[in-house]
Protein backbone atom coordinates (compact mmCIF):
# COMPACT_ATOMS: atom_id res chain seq x y z
CA UNK A 1 0.00 0.00 0.00
CA UNK A 2 1.59 3.26 -1.15
CA UNK A 3 0.64 6.66 -2.50
CA UNK A 4 2.40 9.75 -3.82
CA UNK A 5 0.30 12.70 -4.93
CA UNK A 6 1.13 16.01 -6.52
CA UNK A 7 0.21 19.49 -5.32
CA UNK A 8 -2.57 21.40 -7.01
CA UNK A 9 -3.15 25.15 -6.89
CA UNK A 10 -6.52 25.94 -5.38
CA UNK A 11 -8.79 28.96 -5.29
CA UNK A 12 -10.10 27.79 -1.91
CA UNK A 13 -9.09 29.92 1.07
CA UNK A 14 -8.55 26.87 3.27
CA UNK A 15 -5.14 26.21 4.82
CA UNK A 16 -5.39 22.53 3.80
CA UNK A 17 -3.31 21.83 0.70
CA UNK A 18 -4.94 20.27 -2.36
CA UNK A 19 -3.48 17.29 -4.22
CA UNK A 20 -4.07 15.41 -7.46
CA UNK A 21 -3.30 12.08 -9.09
CA UNK A 22 -1.37 13.67 -11.93
CA UNK A 23 2.13 13.61 -13.39
CA UNK A 24 4.34 10.90 -11.92
CA UNK A 25 1.96 9.98 -9.12
CA UNK A 26 1.54 6.65 -7.28
CA UNK A 27 -1.67 5.00 -6.07
CA UNK A 28 -0.82 1.37 -5.51
CA UNK A 29 -4.35 0.02 -4.97
CA UNK A 30 -7.73 0.90 -3.50
CA UNK A 31 -6.54 0.39 0.07
CA UNK A 32 -5.37 4.00 -0.03
CA UNK A 33 -7.39 6.76 -1.69
CA UNK A 34 -7.16 10.49 -2.26
CA UNK A 35 -10.40 11.98 -0.92
CA UNK A 36 -11.76 15.38 -1.99
CA UNK A 37 -8.31 16.18 -3.34
CA UNK A 38 -7.17 16.92 0.19
CA UNK A 39 -6.53 13.79 2.24
CA UNK A 40 -5.03 10.34 1.90
CA UNK A 41 -7.32 7.79 3.53
CA UNK A 42 -6.29 4.23 4.41
CA UNK A 43 -8.54 1.20 4.74
CA UNK A 44 -6.15 -1.02 6.72
CA UNK A 45 -4.86 -0.54 10.24
CA UNK A 46 -1.09 -0.58 10.60
CA UNK A 47 2.16 1.32 10.67
CA UNK A 48 2.74 3.78 7.85
CA UNK A 49 5.65 5.99 6.89
CA UNK A 50 3.98 9.27 5.93
CA UNK A 51 5.80 12.18 4.30
CA UNK A 52 5.21 15.55 2.73
CA UNK A 53 7.38 18.06 0.96
CA UNK A 54 6.34 21.69 0.61
CA UNK A 55 8.22 24.34 -1.33
CA UNK A 56 7.11 27.92 -0.77
CA UNK A 57 8.15 31.41 -1.74
CA UNK A 58 7.79 34.21 0.79
CA UNK A 59 9.21 37.56 1.78
CA UNK A 60 9.70 38.81 5.33
CA UNK A 61 8.27 42.27 4.69
CA UNK A 62 5.22 41.02 2.81
CA UNK A 63 4.42 38.22 5.30
CA UNK A 64 3.22 38.11 8.88
CA UNK A 65 5.82 38.00 11.65
CA UNK A 66 5.04 34.33 12.22
CA UNK A 67 7.11 31.78 10.26
CA UNK A 68 5.76 29.62 7.46
CA UNK A 69 4.61 26.38 9.10
CA UNK A 70 3.68 23.12 7.38
CA UNK A 71 1.80 20.56 9.47
CA UNK A 72 1.09 16.90 8.77
CA UNK A 73 -2.24 16.14 10.45
CA UNK A 74 -4.33 13.06 11.22
CA UNK A 75 -8.11 12.63 11.29
CA UNK A 76 -9.29 9.29 12.66
CA UNK A 77 -12.97 8.27 12.31
CA UNK A 78 -15.08 9.94 14.98
CA UNK A 79 -12.07 11.69 16.38
CA UNK A 80 -10.56 15.17 16.25
CA UNK A 81 -7.83 16.25 13.89
CA UNK A 82 -4.39 16.23 15.44
CA UNK A 83 -0.89 17.27 14.51
CA UNK A 84 1.62 14.50 13.75
CA UNK A 85 4.53 16.58 12.46
CA UNK A 86 5.34 20.25 11.92
CA UNK A 87 8.16 22.18 10.32
CA UNK A 88 8.79 25.91 10.39
CA UNK A 89 10.86 28.25 8.26
CA UNK A 90 11.31 31.96 8.78
CA UNK A 91 10.49 34.04 5.70
CA UNK A 92 13.32 35.07 3.38
CA UNK A 93 14.49 38.64 2.87
CA UNK A 94 14.90 37.95 -0.87
CA UNK A 95 12.66 39.93 -3.24
CA UNK A 96 10.06 39.53 -4.53
CA UNK A 97 10.18 36.30 -2.52
CA UNK A 98 12.68 33.63 -1.56
CA UNK A 99 11.99 29.95 -2.13
CA UNK A 100 12.48 27.40 0.63
CA UNK A 101 11.62 23.70 0.92
CA UNK A 102 10.34 21.78 3.92
CA UNK A 103 10.35 17.99 4.27
CA UNK A 104 8.31 16.12 6.88
CA UNK A 105 8.28 12.37 7.49
CA UNK A 106 7.59 9.83 10.21
CA UNK A 107 6.19 6.43 11.19
CA UNK A 108 2.68 6.39 12.63
CA UNK A 109 -0.02 3.86 13.52
CA UNK A 110 -3.18 4.51 11.50
CA UNK A 111 -6.63 3.05 12.17
CA UNK A 112 -8.94 1.85 9.38
CA UNK A 113 -10.55 4.91 7.77
CA UNK A 114 -7.90 7.29 9.11
CA UNK A 115 -7.00 10.25 6.90
CA UNK A 116 -3.85 12.35 6.75
CA UNK A 117 -3.58 15.82 5.26
CA UNK A 118 -1.23 18.80 5.10
CA UNK A 119 -1.92 22.26 6.50
CA UNK A 120 0.13 25.39 5.83
CA UNK A 121 0.01 28.89 7.27
CA UNK A 122 -0.33 30.53 3.84
CA UNK A 123 -1.30 28.34 0.87
CA UNK A 124 -0.84 31.24 -1.56
CA UNK A 125 2.92 31.01 -0.96
CA UNK A 126 3.19 27.34 -1.96
CA UNK A 127 5.12 26.49 -5.16
CA UNK A 128 3.26 24.14 -7.52
CA UNK A 129 5.92 23.78 -10.21
CA UNK A 130 6.79 20.21 -11.25
CA UNK A 131 8.18 18.23 -8.33
CA UNK A 132 8.23 21.02 -5.78
CA UNK A 133 5.36 19.99 -3.49
CA UNK A 134 4.17 16.43 -2.89
CA UNK A 135 2.63 14.14 -0.30
CA UNK A 136 2.63 10.40 0.24
CA UNK A 137 2.74 7.33 2.41
CA UNK A 138 3.73 3.68 2.42
CA UNK A 139 2.55 0.84 4.62
CA UNK A 140 5.30 -1.00 6.50
CA UNK B 1 16.75 -4.08 -2.35
CA UNK B 2 18.30 -0.92 -0.90
CA UNK B 3 21.12 1.51 -1.55
CA UNK B 4 22.68 4.52 0.14
CA UNK B 5 25.60 6.23 -1.53
CA UNK B 6 27.86 9.09 -0.53
CA UNK B 7 28.59 12.29 -2.42
CA UNK B 8 31.88 12.70 -4.24
CA UNK B 9 33.46 15.97 -5.33
CA UNK B 10 33.93 16.05 -9.08
CA UNK B 11 35.95 18.09 -11.53
CA UNK B 12 33.23 17.53 -14.15
CA UNK B 13 31.21 20.60 -15.09
CA UNK B 14 27.97 18.59 -15.25
CA UNK B 15 25.04 19.48 -12.99
CA UNK B 16 24.56 15.79 -12.16
CA UNK B 17 25.99 14.95 -8.74
CA UNK B 18 28.58 12.19 -8.40
CA UNK B 19 28.35 9.43 -5.80
CA UNK B 20 30.54 6.66 -4.41
CA UNK B 21 30.28 3.42 -2.45
CA UNK B 22 32.43 4.71 0.40
CA UNK B 23 32.15 5.37 4.10
CA UNK B 24 29.00 3.99 5.67
CA UNK B 25 27.30 3.15 2.37
CA UNK B 26 24.69 0.50 1.60
CA UNK B 27 24.38 -1.67 -1.50
CA UNK B 28 22.17 -4.58 -0.52
CA UNK B 29 22.66 -6.76 -3.59
CA UNK B 30 23.18 -6.62 -7.35
CA UNK B 31 19.54 -5.76 -8.03
CA UNK B 32 20.53 -2.14 -7.53
CA UNK B 33 23.80 -0.71 -8.84
CA UNK B 34 25.60 2.61 -8.93
CA UNK B 35 26.42 3.32 -12.57
CA UNK B 36 29.17 5.70 -13.70
CA UNK B 37 29.16 7.14 -10.19
CA UNK B 38 26.08 9.15 -11.08
CA UNK B 39 22.92 7.05 -11.09
CA UNK B 40 21.25 4.28 -9.13
CA UNK B 41 19.86 1.66 -11.52
CA UNK B 42 17.35 -1.01 -10.55
CA UNK B 43 16.83 -4.40 -12.19
CA UNK B 44 13.36 -5.16 -10.77
CA UNK B 45 10.11 -3.35 -11.47
CA UNK B 46 8.26 -2.11 -8.42
CA UNK B 47 7.59 0.66 -5.96
CA UNK B 48 10.64 2.34 -4.44
CA UNK B 49 11.06 5.01 -1.80
CA UNK B 50 13.81 7.21 -3.25
CA UNK B 51 15.55 9.98 -1.32
CA UNK B 52 18.38 12.45 -1.56
CA UNK B 53 19.93 14.94 0.80
CA UNK B 54 22.04 17.82 -0.45
CA UNK B 55 23.90 20.31 1.74
CA UNK B 56 25.27 23.36 -0.02
CA UNK B 57 26.99 26.62 0.83
CA UNK B 58 26.14 29.74 -1.13
CA UNK B 59 26.03 33.51 -0.90
CA UNK B 60 23.38 35.76 -2.43
CA UNK B 61 25.85 38.28 -3.85
CA UNK B 62 28.16 35.67 -5.36
CA UNK B 63 25.35 33.54 -6.85
CA UNK B 64 22.84 34.04 -9.62
CA UNK B 65 19.44 35.51 -8.74
CA UNK B 66 17.89 32.06 -9.14
CA UNK B 67 17.68 29.86 -6.01
CA UNK B 68 19.71 26.71 -5.48
CA UNK B 69 17.58 23.84 -6.78
CA UNK B 70 18.12 20.11 -6.25
CA UNK B 71 16.18 17.75 -8.50
CA UNK B 72 15.62 14.02 -8.24
CA UNK B 73 15.31 12.74 -11.82
CA UNK B 74 14.32 9.50 -13.53
CA UNK B 75 15.62 7.95 -16.74
CA UNK B 76 13.68 4.89 -17.89
CA UNK B 77 14.98 2.74 -20.77
CA UNK B 78 14.04 4.27 -24.12
CA UNK B 79 12.35 7.21 -22.41
CA UNK B 80 13.27 10.83 -21.76
CA UNK B 81 14.56 12.04 -18.42
CA UNK B 82 11.93 13.48 -16.12
CA UNK B 83 11.82 15.28 -12.80
CA UNK B 84 10.37 13.33 -9.86
CA UNK B 85 11.06 15.79 -7.04
CA UNK B 86 12.61 19.23 -6.63
CA UNK B 87 13.50 21.46 -3.72
CA UNK B 88 14.62 25.07 -3.77
CA UNK B 89 16.43 27.28 -1.29
CA UNK B 90 17.25 30.93 -1.72
CA UNK B 91 20.93 31.75 -1.21
CA UNK B 92 22.06 32.95 2.19
CA UNK B 93 23.39 36.43 2.93
CA UNK B 94 26.04 34.92 5.23
CA UNK B 95 29.68 35.38 4.21
CA UNK B 96 31.67 33.83 2.66
CA UNK B 97 28.69 31.49 2.25
CA UNK B 98 25.85 30.10 4.30
CA UNK B 99 25.18 26.38 4.55
CA UNK B 100 21.71 24.96 3.97
CA UNK B 101 20.39 21.41 3.63
CA UNK B 102 17.70 20.05 1.35
CA UNK B 103 15.95 16.70 1.74
CA UNK B 104 13.91 15.05 -1.02
CA UNK B 105 11.97 11.80 -0.78
CA UNK B 106 9.03 10.01 -2.34
CA UNK B 107 7.48 6.74 -3.51
CA UNK B 108 7.74 5.98 -7.22
CA UNK B 109 7.14 3.08 -9.59
CA UNK B 110 10.34 2.12 -11.39
CA UNK B 111 10.65 -0.12 -14.46
CA UNK B 112 13.46 -2.68 -14.90
CA UNK B 113 16.59 -0.83 -15.94
CA UNK B 114 15.31 2.53 -14.69
CA UNK B 115 17.90 4.93 -13.28
CA UNK B 116 17.55 7.78 -10.82
CA UNK B 117 20.00 10.63 -10.37
CA UNK B 118 20.34 14.03 -8.70
CA UNK B 119 20.79 17.34 -10.49
CA UNK B 120 21.72 20.66 -8.87
CA UNK B 121 21.93 24.18 -10.21
CA UNK B 122 25.53 24.65 -9.04
CA UNK B 123 27.53 21.54 -8.06
CA UNK B 124 30.47 23.69 -6.91
CA UNK B 125 28.35 24.82 -3.95
CA UNK B 126 27.65 21.29 -2.68
CA UNK B 127 29.16 20.25 0.68
CA UNK B 128 30.94 16.89 0.59
CA UNK B 129 31.93 16.65 4.26
CA UNK B 130 31.04 13.41 6.05
CA UNK B 131 27.30 12.83 6.09
CA UNK B 132 26.24 16.08 4.44
CA UNK B 133 25.16 14.87 1.01
CA UNK B 134 23.77 11.40 0.21
CA UNK B 135 21.38 9.54 -2.05
CA UNK B 136 19.50 6.29 -1.75
CA UNK B 137 16.48 4.10 -2.29
CA UNK B 138 14.67 1.10 -0.90
CA UNK B 139 12.22 -1.28 -2.56
CA UNK B 140 8.85 -1.57 -0.85
CA UNK C 1 10.17 -3.13 13.79
CA UNK C 2 9.56 0.63 13.93
CA UNK C 3 9.88 3.54 16.32
CA UNK C 4 9.00 7.23 16.36
CA UNK C 5 9.85 9.26 19.45
CA UNK C 6 9.20 12.84 20.46
CA UNK C 7 11.69 15.47 21.55
CA UNK C 8 12.00 16.38 25.20
CA UNK C 9 13.52 19.55 26.61
CA UNK C 10 16.48 18.74 28.85
CA UNK C 11 18.45 20.60 31.49
CA UNK C 12 21.52 18.54 30.56
CA UNK C 13 24.28 20.42 28.80
CA UNK C 14 24.99 17.53 26.42
CA UNK C 15 24.67 18.02 22.67
CA UNK C 16 22.76 14.73 22.39
CA UNK C 17 19.03 15.35 22.04
CA UNK C 18 16.62 13.75 24.49
CA UNK C 19 13.48 11.87 23.43
CA UNK C 20 10.37 10.41 25.03
CA UNK C 21 7.61 7.93 24.31
CA UNK C 22 4.89 10.55 24.56
CA UNK C 23 2.14 12.05 22.43
CA UNK C 24 1.64 10.23 19.13
CA UNK C 25 4.73 8.05 19.45
CA UNK C 26 5.42 4.60 17.98
CA UNK C 27 7.26 1.69 19.56
CA UNK C 28 6.23 -1.39 17.60
CA UNK C 29 7.73 -4.06 19.85
CA UNK C 30 10.69 -4.78 22.14
CA UNK C 31 13.08 -5.31 19.22
CA UNK C 32 13.66 -1.58 19.30
CA UNK C 33 13.95 0.39 22.55
CA UNK C 34 14.55 3.96 23.63
CA UNK C 35 17.52 3.86 26.04
CA UNK C 36 18.24 6.60 28.61
CA UNK C 37 15.91 8.86 26.66
CA UNK C 38 18.68 9.46 24.14
CA UNK C 39 19.19 6.55 21.75
CA UNK C 40 17.17 4.04 19.75
CA UNK C 41 18.70 0.59 20.13
CA UNK C 42 17.90 -2.37 17.88
CA UNK C 43 18.15 -6.06 18.76
CA UNK C 44 18.11 -7.46 15.21
CA UNK C 45 20.71 -7.03 12.50
CA UNK C 46 19.43 -5.65 9.21
CA UNK C 47 18.76 -2.66 7.01
CA UNK C 48 16.91 0.21 8.62
CA UNK C 49 15.59 3.50 7.29
CA UNK C 50 16.50 5.97 10.02
CA UNK C 51 15.27 9.57 10.15
CA UNK C 52 15.25 12.64 12.33
CA UNK C 53 13.63 16.02 12.12
CA UNK C 54 14.91 18.97 14.12
CA UNK C 55 13.32 22.41 14.25
CA UNK C 56 15.39 25.14 15.83
CA UNK C 57 15.24 28.87 16.40
CA UNK C 58 18.43 30.91 16.18
CA UNK C 59 19.75 34.36 15.40
CA UNK C 60 22.96 35.17 13.56
CA UNK C 61 24.09 37.86 15.98
CA UNK C 62 23.37 35.80 19.10
CA UNK C 63 24.94 32.58 17.77
CA UNK C 64 28.45 31.49 16.91
CA UNK C 65 29.68 31.99 13.35
CA UNK C 66 29.33 28.25 12.75
CA UNK C 67 25.99 27.02 11.34
CA UNK C 68 23.49 24.96 13.29
CA UNK C 69 24.32 21.32 12.54
CA UNK C 70 22.23 18.25 13.29
CA UNK C 71 23.97 14.87 13.09
CA UNK C 72 22.53 11.38 13.04
CA UNK C 73 25.12 9.15 14.74
CA UNK C 74 25.68 5.43 15.23
CA UNK C 75 27.19 3.53 18.15
CA UNK C 76 27.77 -0.16 17.49
CA UNK C 77 28.77 -2.51 20.35
CA UNK C 78 32.51 -2.33 20.94
CA UNK C 79 32.94 0.28 18.22
CA UNK C 80 33.43 4.04 18.16
CA UNK C 81 30.60 6.47 17.45
CA UNK C 82 30.35 7.57 13.86
CA UNK C 83 28.35 10.09 11.86
CA UNK C 84 25.76 8.66 9.45
CA UNK C 85 24.11 11.88 8.28
CA UNK C 86 24.47 15.60 8.88
CA UNK C 87 22.56 18.71 7.87
CA UNK C 88 23.56 22.32 8.33
CA UNK C 89 21.60 25.57 8.32
CA UNK C 90 23.04 29.04 8.68
CA UNK C 91 21.42 31.08 11.46
CA UNK C 92 18.61 33.46 10.56
CA UNK C 93 18.80 37.23 10.79
CA UNK C 94 15.22 37.31 12.15
CA UNK C 95 14.76 38.59 15.69
CA UNK C 96 14.61 37.41 18.40
CA UNK C 97 15.28 34.23 16.41
CA UNK C 98 14.20 32.61 13.18
CA UNK C 99 12.83 29.09 13.04
CA UNK C 100 14.17 26.54 10.58
CA UNK C 101 13.61 22.81 10.16
CA UNK C 102 16.08 20.11 9.18
CA UNK C 103 15.20 16.62 7.98
CA UNK C 104 17.66 13.74 7.85
CA UNK C 105 17.02 10.24 6.56
CA UNK C 106 18.81 7.25 5.06
CA UNK C 107 19.16 3.48 4.81
CA UNK C 108 21.81 1.87 6.98
CA UNK C 109 22.88 -1.61 8.06
CA UNK C 110 22.69 -1.97 11.85
CA UNK C 111 24.23 -4.73 13.96
CA UNK C 112 22.44 -6.31 16.95
CA UNK C 113 22.74 -3.91 19.89
CA UNK C 114 23.53 -0.91 17.66
CA UNK C 115 22.23 2.45 18.84
CA UNK C 116 21.45 5.62 16.89
CA UNK C 117 21.17 9.09 18.35
CA UNK C 118 20.98 12.74 17.31
CA UNK C 119 23.55 15.42 18.09
CA UNK C 120 23.10 19.17 17.59
CA UNK C 121 25.49 22.08 17.91
CA UNK C 122 23.23 23.96 20.35
CA UNK C 123 20.40 22.03 22.05
CA UNK C 124 19.07 25.22 23.66
CA UNK C 125 17.95 26.38 20.21
CA UNK C 126 15.82 23.29 19.52
CA UNK C 127 12.02 23.73 19.30
CA UNK C 128 10.08 21.21 21.38
CA UNK C 129 6.55 22.32 20.47
CA UNK C 130 4.17 19.56 19.36
CA UNK C 131 5.39 17.88 16.18
CA UNK C 132 8.46 20.04 15.57
CA UNK C 133 11.27 17.66 16.53
CA UNK C 134 11.17 13.85 16.25
CA UNK C 135 13.29 10.79 15.58
CA UNK C 136 12.58 7.32 14.31
CA UNK C 137 13.40 4.24 12.30
CA UNK C 138 11.85 1.33 10.50
CA UNK C 139 13.30 -2.07 9.59
CA UNK C 140 13.17 -2.92 5.90
Amino acid sequence: IAAHVISEASSKTTSVLQWAEKGYYTMSNNLVTLENGKQLTVKRQGLYYIYAQVTFCSNREASSQAPFIASLCLKSPGRFERILLRAANTHSSAKPCGQQSIHLGGVFELQPGASVFVNVTDPSQVSHGTGFTSFGLLKL
Amino acid sequence: IAAHVISEASSKTTSVLQWAEKGYYTMSNNLVTLENGKQLTVKRQGLYYIYAQVTFCSNREASSQAPFIASLCLKSPGRFERILLRAANTHSSAKPCGQQSIHLGGVFELQPGASVFVNVTDPSQVSHGTGFTSFGLLKL
Amino acid sequence: IAAHVISEASSKTTSVLQWAEKGYYTMSNNLVTLENGKQLTVKRQGLYYIYAQVTFCSNREASSQAPFIASLCLKSPGRFERILLRAANTHSSAKPCGQQSIHLGGVFELQPGASVFVNVTDPSQVSHGTGFTSFGLLKL
Epitope: A114 | - | A20, K22, G23, Y24, T130
Partner: nanobody
Framework: EVQLLESGGGLVQPGGSLRLSCAAS????????MSWVRQAPGKGLEWVSG????????YYADSVKGRFTISRDNSKNTLYLQMNSLRAEDTAVYYC??????????WGQGTLVTVSS
Protein backbone atom coordinates in the same frame (compact mmCIF):
# COMPACT_ATOMS: atom_id res chain seq x y z
CA GLU D 1 -3.08 1.82 38.73
CA VAL D 2 -4.33 4.51 36.36
CA GLN D 3 -7.01 6.72 37.88
CA LEU D 4 -8.90 9.65 36.38
CA LEU D 5 -11.24 11.53 38.69
CA GLU D 6 -13.55 14.19 37.26
CA SER D 7 -15.21 16.93 39.29
CA GLY D 8 -16.93 20.27 38.81
CA GLY D 9 -20.17 19.17 37.19
CA GLY D 10 -23.59 20.39 38.29
CA LEU D 11 -26.71 22.27 37.32
CA VAL D 12 -26.28 25.55 35.48
CA GLN D 13 -28.58 27.91 33.59
CA PRO D 14 -28.27 28.43 29.83
CA GLY D 15 -25.57 31.02 29.13
CA GLY D 16 -23.79 30.12 32.35
CA SER D 17 -20.31 28.72 32.98
CA LEU D 18 -18.70 25.70 34.65
CA ARG D 19 -15.13 24.51 35.09
CA LEU D 20 -14.47 20.79 35.07
CA SER D 21 -11.33 19.27 36.54
CA CYS D 22 -9.77 15.84 36.11
CA ALA D 23 -7.17 14.64 38.62
CA ALA D 24 -4.89 12.00 37.12
CA SER D 25 -2.67 9.46 38.85
CA UNK D 26 -0.90 6.18 38.18
CA UNK D 27 0.82 7.25 34.94
CA UNK D 28 3.19 9.91 33.63
CA UNK D 29 0.60 12.60 32.94
CA UNK D 30 2.83 14.87 30.84
CA UNK D 31 3.48 12.16 28.26
CA UNK D 32 -0.08 11.80 27.01
CA UNK D 33 -2.64 13.68 25.01
CA MET D 34 -5.69 14.12 27.23
CA SER D 35 -9.27 14.57 26.12
CA TRP D 36 -12.75 15.40 27.27
CA VAL D 37 -15.53 13.18 25.87
CA ARG D 38 -19.23 13.48 26.64
CA GLN D 39 -22.36 11.35 26.45
CA ALA D 40 -25.73 13.05 26.29
CA PRO D 41 -28.78 11.16 27.62
CA GLY D 42 -29.73 8.43 25.15
CA LYS D 43 -26.89 9.33 22.77
CA GLY D 44 -23.49 7.94 21.86
CA LEU D 45 -20.09 9.23 22.94
CA GLU D 46 -19.02 12.57 21.46
CA TRP D 47 -15.46 13.79 21.58
CA VAL D 48 -15.33 17.38 22.90
CA SER D 49 -11.74 18.56 23.19
CA GLY D 50 -8.13 17.40 23.37
CA UNK D 51 -4.79 18.83 24.43
CA UNK D 52 -1.27 17.73 23.50
CA UNK D 53 1.17 16.67 26.27
CA UNK D 54 2.95 20.04 26.35
CA UNK D 55 -0.32 21.96 26.37
CA UNK D 56 0.82 24.01 23.38
CA UNK D 57 -1.76 22.63 20.93
CA UNK D 58 -5.47 22.22 21.61
CA TYR D 59 -8.30 20.68 19.58
CA TYR D 60 -12.07 21.27 19.74
CA ALA D 61 -15.22 19.78 18.26
CA ASP D 62 -17.03 22.31 16.06
CA SER D 63 -20.00 22.24 18.45
CA VAL D 64 -17.95 23.75 21.31
CA LYS D 65 -15.37 25.86 19.45
CA GLY D 66 -15.18 29.37 20.87
CA ARG D 67 -17.13 28.44 23.99
CA PHE D 68 -15.01 25.78 25.69
CA THR D 69 -11.33 26.00 26.63
CA ILE D 70 -9.23 22.98 27.52
CA SER D 71 -6.06 23.36 29.58
CA ARG D 72 -3.73 21.29 31.72
CA ASP D 73 -1.36 21.76 34.62
CA ASN D 74 1.32 19.11 34.30
CA SER D 75 2.82 20.04 37.67
CA LYS D 76 -0.52 19.12 39.30
CA ASN D 77 -1.40 16.20 36.98
CA THR D 78 -4.70 17.91 36.30
CA LEU D 79 -6.80 18.50 33.18
CA TYR D 80 -9.39 21.27 32.96
CA LEU D 81 -12.34 22.23 30.79
CA GLN D 82 -13.68 25.76 31.07
CA MET D 83 -17.21 25.79 29.65
CA ASN D 84 -18.81 29.15 28.84
CA SER D 85 -22.09 30.12 27.12
CA LEU D 86 -23.55 26.76 28.01
CA ARG D 87 -26.56 25.48 26.08
CA ALA D 88 -29.18 22.84 26.79
CA GLU D 89 -27.53 20.56 24.21
CA ASP D 90 -24.35 20.56 26.32
CA THR D 91 -26.16 18.50 28.94
CA ALA D 92 -24.21 15.25 29.28
CA VAL D 93 -21.91 13.17 31.40
CA TYR D 94 -18.38 14.49 30.78
CA TYR D 95 -15.50 12.02 30.88
CA CYS D 96 -11.80 12.68 31.06
CA UNK D 97 -9.84 10.25 28.83
CA UNK D 98 -6.17 9.33 28.45
CA UNK D 99 -4.96 8.61 24.95
CA UNK D 100 -2.13 6.41 23.70
CA UNK D 101 -1.23 6.57 20.00
CA UNK D 102 -4.72 7.22 18.73
CA UNK D 103 -6.84 5.19 21.13
CA UNK D 104 -8.43 6.07 24.46
CA UNK D 105 -7.13 3.51 26.90
CA UNK D 106 -8.43 4.86 30.23
CA TRP D 107 -11.54 6.82 31.21
CA GLY D 108 -12.79 8.45 34.38
CA GLN D 109 -16.18 7.72 35.91
CA GLY D 110 -17.61 10.97 34.60
CA THR D 111 -19.25 14.09 35.99
CA LEU D 112 -22.79 15.18 35.08
CA VAL D 113 -23.40 18.61 33.60
CA THR D 114 -27.02 19.71 33.37
CA VAL D 115 -27.93 22.91 31.53
CA SER D 116 -31.47 23.90 32.32
CA SER D 117 -33.52 26.90 33.37
Amino acid sequence: EVQLLESGGGLVQPGGSLRLSCAASGFTFDKYLMSWVRQAPGKGLEWVSGIEPLGDVTYYADSVKGRFTISRDNSKNTLYLQMNSLRAEDTAVYYCAKEASGDFDYWGQGTLVTVSS
